[in-house]
């Protein structure tokens, strides 16, 4: 099973220069339970919600959003009406957060390419995202790698050789930037919270098997949301309007009720039991 990926694409409509569309998609095996689109930054980290889409309950959208809709079972689009003459959308970062079962919550941000022609935009280039359950391994291997690298550095310095620069295998500038950022962020997340993994975040004792739409609980410690350069609007190398951040933990806020995640399982911010917050979440 491949690691989930999220892509974001922002484009200006060819017919109306004041009209923009944000496209977001989730590439992963899980079922999507909620999508949140925000602007000005990630949801819960300075961003303002523009729309929330639930696959069965419907959508909720707020100005300047004009129409939020599902394009496929794993992608959405959000049309925006730019009423201002100064076209503020052109310099804005748009973020899409996909909550999925069983992967958790994944968020990506993107902005309109600075010199893009109306109606044109590069195809989304998803970058591999690191699963939280790899973060612990990466954290440990990162320390070991750093140690080995440092020893190597000392040895080479003694031989008066220049330090070799490690390059990722990708040549795409987006991939280079995002990939270079992702491992360090994931490692930090693992060091900050070694329990932020999918496998250890449920409370098995509270799984509800009595109803098809039952609930399970999620400990608050799994709600860590690393933020990094990919959350910033000023990432000049990411010029084509689409980039991907690392997996951002599970559900963003410990006190926030997460979405309905699929048959027989939903996550809660604590372990009070399946009826602690009965029903299903959604924002229309």
């Amino acid at each position: 099973a491949g690691t989930p990926e999220v892509w974001v694409q922002v484009q200006m409509e060819a017919t109306e220069l004041s009209s923009f569309t944000v496209h977001c998609g989730f590439l992963g095996p899980g079922s999507i339970s909620l999508v949140t689109v925000s602007w000005g930054g990630p949801d819960g980290a300075g961003g303002t919600k523009l729309a929330v889409l639930h696959p069965e309950l419907g959508t909720r959208q707020w100005a300047p959003a004009r129409q939020a809709r599902w394009e496929t079972q794993s992608s959405i689009s959000l049309a925006l009406e730019d009423s201002g003459a100064s076209s503020p959308f052109a310099n804005t970062t748009f973020c899409c957060k996909f909550a999925s079962f069983p992967e958790g919550s994944w968020e990506s941000c993107g902005s309109l390419p600075p010199s893009s022609d109306p109606g044109l935009s590069a195809p989304p280039t998803p970058v591999p995202i690191l699963r939280a359950d790899l973060a612990g391994i990466l954290g440990l291997s990162g320390v070991l790698l750093f140690g080995c690298g440092y020893l190597l550095h000392l040895l080479r310095r003694q031989k008066h050789r220049p330090t070799p620069r490690l390059q990722p295998s990708h040549t795409n500038s987006q991939a280079l930037t995002a990939q270079a950022w992702a491992p360090s962020q994931a490692s930090q997340a693992a060091l900050h919270d070694p329990y932020a993994t999918i496998n250890t975040s449920f409370c098995p004792a509270t799984l509800d098997t009595a109803h098809p739409n039952g609930w399970a609980s999620l400990p608050t410690h799994a709600a860590h949301q690393p933020q990094g350069p990919a959350a910033s609007a000023s990432t000049p190398i990411l010029a084509r309007g689409s980039f991907v951040s690392v997996e951002n933990g599970l559900y963003t806020q410990a006190g926030e009720r997460p979405p309905h995640t699929g048959p027989g399982l939903t996550l809660f911010p604590d372990c009070r039991g399946p009826r602690a917050l009965e029903g299903r979440f959604g924002v229309r």
């Epitope: 696959p55 309950l57 806020q253 009720r257 029903g279």
Partner: antibody, heavy 114, light 113 residues
Framework: EVQLVQSGAEVKKPGSSVKVSCKAS????????IEWVRQAPGQGLEWMGE????????NYNEKFKGRVTITADESTSTAYMELSSLRSEDTAVYYC???????WGQGTLVTVSS | DIVMTQSPDSLAVSLGERATINCKSS????????????LAWYQQKPGQPPKLLIY???TRESGVPDRFSGSGSGTDFTLTISSLQAEDVAVYYC?????????FGQGTKLEIK
């Protein structure tokens, strides 16, 4: 446990205003919409509008635009619905709701009578 | 606005029998992108707020007995109670969850025959 607790019944004169409150608990108030729905005696349900407390973004039913104002106070996790220029037809039970109408307040009866 | 029309306005069914309520929308509630129907059903008992029963046209809300089921697509939907119980006496509403503003049907009053 998610709870929406509304203010008590009100009797108002035609032409006046009423402000109904809805205190939310059991979830992050700022993250999700609070909807307002009204139900006249023996009648159906009518959506009035909504607010997203985190950003105070609102959507209103065109029918009530100009007469209804929905606000929210994050510090107290309370949403408010104010209806002005009241007339007898506004006599109804007013409900607040959240999570796509999965959770509801107990309702507030507003009676408009001279 | 999408107009929701329910039929019948009232219905009397014997205990243990099947009850069927229909709902028709003036526009399709089907999203072609993900092939989901955005329709919900509510139950309201006297003096109480409505209670969500079904969403997505056919998904039962948590805790709702399995005698309640929803079906339909596009503009025509049905709520079925397979075996009527005394506690099912209530008014039932369908609701457009597809587009703004959310609109409700006029309601169907279900009684015991």
């Amino acid at each position: 446990e998610v709870q929406l607790v509304q203010s008590g019944a009100e009797v108002k004169k035609p032409g006046s205003s009423v402000k109904v409150s809805c205190k939310a608990s059991g979830y992050t108030f700022s993250s999700f919409s609070i909807e307002w729905v009204r139900q006249a005696p023996g009648q159906g349900l009518e959506w009035m509008g909504e607010i997203l407390p985190g950003s105070n973004s609102t959507n209103y039913n065109e029918k009530f635009k100009g007469r209804v104002t929905i606000t929210a106070d994050e510090s107290t996790s309370t949403a408010y619905m104010e209806l002005s220029s009241l007339r007898s037809e506004d006599t109804a039970v007013y409900y607040c709701s959240s999570y796509w109408f999965a959770y509801w307040g107990q309702g507030t009866l507003v009676t408009v009578s001279s | 606005d999408i107009v929701m029309t329910q039929s019948p306005d009232s219905l009397a069914v014997s205990l243990g029998e099947r009850a069927t309520i229909n709902c028709k929308s003036s526009q399709s509630l089907l999203n072609s992108g993900n092939q989901k129907n955005y329709l919900a059903w509510y139950q309201q008992k006297p003096g109480q707020p409505p209670k969500l029963l079904i969403y997505g046209a056919s998904t039962r809300e948590s805790g709702v007995p399995d005698r309640f089921s929803g079906s339909g697509s596009g503009t025509d939907f049905t709520l079925t109670i397979s075996s009527l119980q005394a506690e099912d006496v209530a008014v039932y509403y369908c609701q457009n969850a597809h587009s703004y503003p959310p609109t409700f049907g006029q309601g169907t009053k279900l009684e015991i025959k």
